[in-house]
């Protein structure tokens, strides 16, 4: 068997609602990932887990389950969304989130994602993570790529 | 450290115009809007208006409008607020603000300048 | 624009009284994020305008848990639980919600 390809591409949109009286904010993430199928046979993209993190607690977790099928040398983007939650110990940045001063609130969150994979009765999963930044002030459609963070460390947070 | 130094006191002409300065330290000035506001002698404050030192984009009260022109100079970290045709009623103090972000905790501070104090007078 | 009208213009009170001020907007200062950006603010004589409150009740970092903020809609409220001496002031609401921006006419506490 050859290989299948999966490239996370990025953030395509972040959705953004607020409880005012628990101080809590609530993200819609959508993403979006490029799977390709390197075979001369189709493949079945079983499910796909993510789970998001900000400063290094998981705010957000989904799994979507039998997806599609990827049909010989071929490529499918999926979009898949997360909802989030920042609250309780991380109320704080509701303020941050809502604050007029500001006109963009990046925060840097970590994506995870795992890709399940069948064919012929074989799974395989493929993993990525990478750091995006989102901005928890408003509702925004990104470029695909445009929400990288680039710093390879771990941000301060 | 997160700070906002404003010039220093005018004394200046009825008809003449006059530009303060709002010089910020421990932040970029292109990351948030710029406010100005005014306190008249034994009187309230007067929200004047903000900037967006970024694109220069400005907003006004419109009892400001045609009197006040905000601009901003992100190179030197410096916002601007220039007075037109001064009357006695532009004799107040004139203070900058914004509120940042000072650390990498994402949390916030309000931020004033000490306040430049205008006089017109004949 | 929104009118910020503030109750009563001057306000004496003992020290370790109770101090509340009013404050009422002439139109609702919902934000379209669903905030209410309504602050208040001690000015002292030769002093930079200091923040209390934000956000109706949030207070702001260092200031005394004696200061409490209250309301909705259009009224709202500032009190003071027991007054000290370093309260004394001018006190202004402001609206951050709706530009222009505006602020309350003030409210000056002082000694009875």
């Known amino acids: 068997p050859r290989s299948i390809d999966v490239k996370y591409i990025g953030v395509k949109s972040a959705y953004v609602s607020y409880d005012v009286q628990k101080r809590t904010i609530y993200l819609n993430i959508t993403n979006t990932l490029n799977i390709t199928n390197n075979n001369y046979y189709s493949v079945e993209v079983e499910n796909i887990t993510a789970q998001v993190q900000f400063s290094k607690t998981v705010i957000g977790k989904a799994r979507l389950n039998n997806i599609t099928i990827i049909g010989p040398l071929d490529m499918k983007q999926i979009d898949y969304t997360v909802p989030t939650v920042i609250a309780e110990e991380m109320s704080y940045m509701y303020d941050f989130c809502t604050l007029i001063s500001i006109k963009v609130h990046n925060i840097v969150l970590m994506m995870q994602v795992t890709v399940t994979t069948t064919y012929f009765g074989h799974s395989e999963q493929i993993s990525q993570e990478r750091y995006q930044y989102v901005d928890c002030g408003r509702n925004t459609t990104y470029q695909l790529g445009q929400s990288e963070y680039l710093n390879v460390l771990q941000p301060q947070q | 450290e997160v700070q906002l130094q404003q010039s220093g006191a005018e004394l200046m002409r009825p008809g003449a115009s006059v530009k303060l300065s709002c010089t910020a330290s421990?932040?970029?000035?292109?990351?948030?809007?710029m406010y100005w506001v005014k306190q008249r002698p034994e009187q309230g404050l007067e929200w004047i208006g903000r900037?967006?030192?970024?694109?220069?984009?400005?907003e006004y009260a419109p009892k400001f409008q045609g009197k006040a022109t905000m601009t901003a100079d992100t190179s030197s970290n410096t916002a601007y607020l220039q007075l037109s045709s001064l009357t006695s009623e532009d004799t107040a103090v004139y203070y900058c603000s914004t509120r940042v972000i000072y650390d990498g905790y994402y949390r916030t501070m309000d931020c004033w300048g000490q306040g430049t104090s205008v006089t017109v007078s004949s | 624009d929104v009118l910020m009208t503030q109750i009563p213009l001057s306000l004496p009170v003992s020290l370790g009284d109770q101090a509340s001020i009013s404050c009422r907007s002439s139109q609702t200062i919902v934000h379209s994020n669903g905030n209410t950006y309504l602050e208040w603010y001690l000015k002292k004589p030769g002093q930079s305008p200091k923040l209390l409150i934000d956000?109706?009740?949030n207070r702001f970092s260092g200031v005394p848990d004696r200061f409490s903020g209250s309301g909705s809609g259009t009224d709202f409220t500032l009190k003071i639980s027991r007054v000290e001496a370093e309260d004394l002031g001018v006190y202004y609401c402001f609206q951050g919600s709706h530009v222009p921006y505006t602020f309350g006419g003030g409210t000056k506490l002082e000694i009875k």
């Open positions: 900037i967006d030192p970024e694109d220069g984009d400005a």
């Open positions: 421990g932040f970029n000035i292109q990351d948030y809007y």
């Open positions: 956000k109706i009740s």
